[in-house]
Interface confidence: low
């Protein structure tokens, strides 16, 4: 039993690595968008026991325009940097290389995404010919944490934040 292609999520892509039952996959917000706090990018292939049909759980993901980009003005044609400071990117981004032999489920095919391998120890290796990053999955026998009977986290939100799975109320982000 396998799942059909997952649903589209606005401003997000998903690279499905396995359509098999209980597979977990993660959506990635497109370039220029970010995951709204408290929303989940995870989806799981589950079985509807009544119909014996597999389907993907509905992610609560909301991809909002990155506020850091929304308010940026285009740079003038020529600028002079007087302090000798080289502007640096705010944070490091995924490589944007598309993994081979994967099909995107997306409403924006122009977006670049990074493949996320759930529950895998990352052993990236550079491909000598293309320079793309290959991500290998190593199982528990290679010294990675046990993947069996993972205990649910009993997390308690700090300060005024709600527990996991409860979306923050009155969040100012808008799409």
């Amino acid at each position: 039993i396998t799942c059909p292609p997952p649903m589209s999520v606005e401003h997000a892509d998903i690279w499905v690595k396995s359509y098999s039952l209980y597979s977990r996959e993660r959506y990635i917000c497109n370039s220029g968008f970010k995951r709204k706090a408290g929303t989940s990018s995870l989806t799981e292939c589950v079985l509807n026991k009544a119909t014996n049909v597999a389907h993907w759980t509905t992610p609560s993901l909301k991809c909002i325009r990155d506020p850091a980009l929304v308010h940026q003005r285009p740079a003038p044609p020529s600028t002079v940097t007087t302090a000798g400071v080289t502007p640096q990117p705010e944070s490091l981004s995924p490589s944007g290389k598309e993994p081979a032999a994967s099909s995107p489920s997306s409403n924006n095919t122009a977006a670049t995404t990074a493949a996320i391998v759930p529950g895998s120890q990352l052993m990236p290796s550079k491909s000598p010919s293309t320079g793309t990053t290959e991500i290998s999955s190593h199982e528990s026998s290679h010294g990675t944490p046990s993947q069996t009977t993972a205990k649910n986290w009993e997390l308690t939100a700090s300060a005024s934040h709600q527990p996991p799975g409860v979306y923050p109320q009155g969040h100012s982000d808008t799409t």
Partner: nanobody, 124 residues
Amino acid sequence: EVQLVESGGGLVQAGGSLRLSCAASGFTFDDYAIGWFRQAPGKEREGVSCMDSSDGSTYYADSVKGRFTISSDNAKNMVYLQMNSLKVEDTAVYYCAILDCAVVTTLGGEYDYWGQGTQVTVSS
């Protein structure tokens, strides 16, 4: 190239403190939640703490609440776990991981990426 590299583990007496560090690179901090989980020999892995970088929300397991503090330095792409009043039962390998605070209860705690781990041993 995504990398998570933990450091700061070691041997400490009960009641002591340690500060674990996680150097992260290769992804946009704000797009993910980052946290710590641990695994003691012969035991299930256990979530310790989680921070949603997009809004700064922090979450703690009941077993460490009030003793552990998670923090981050986004400019340096670093995540820290300050562990105070350590107990013998805190002995484990501690892993820094990219995860999703919002789904750890609904989907059992899924760790997308994790580092090689750092050993923390608390002696009596």
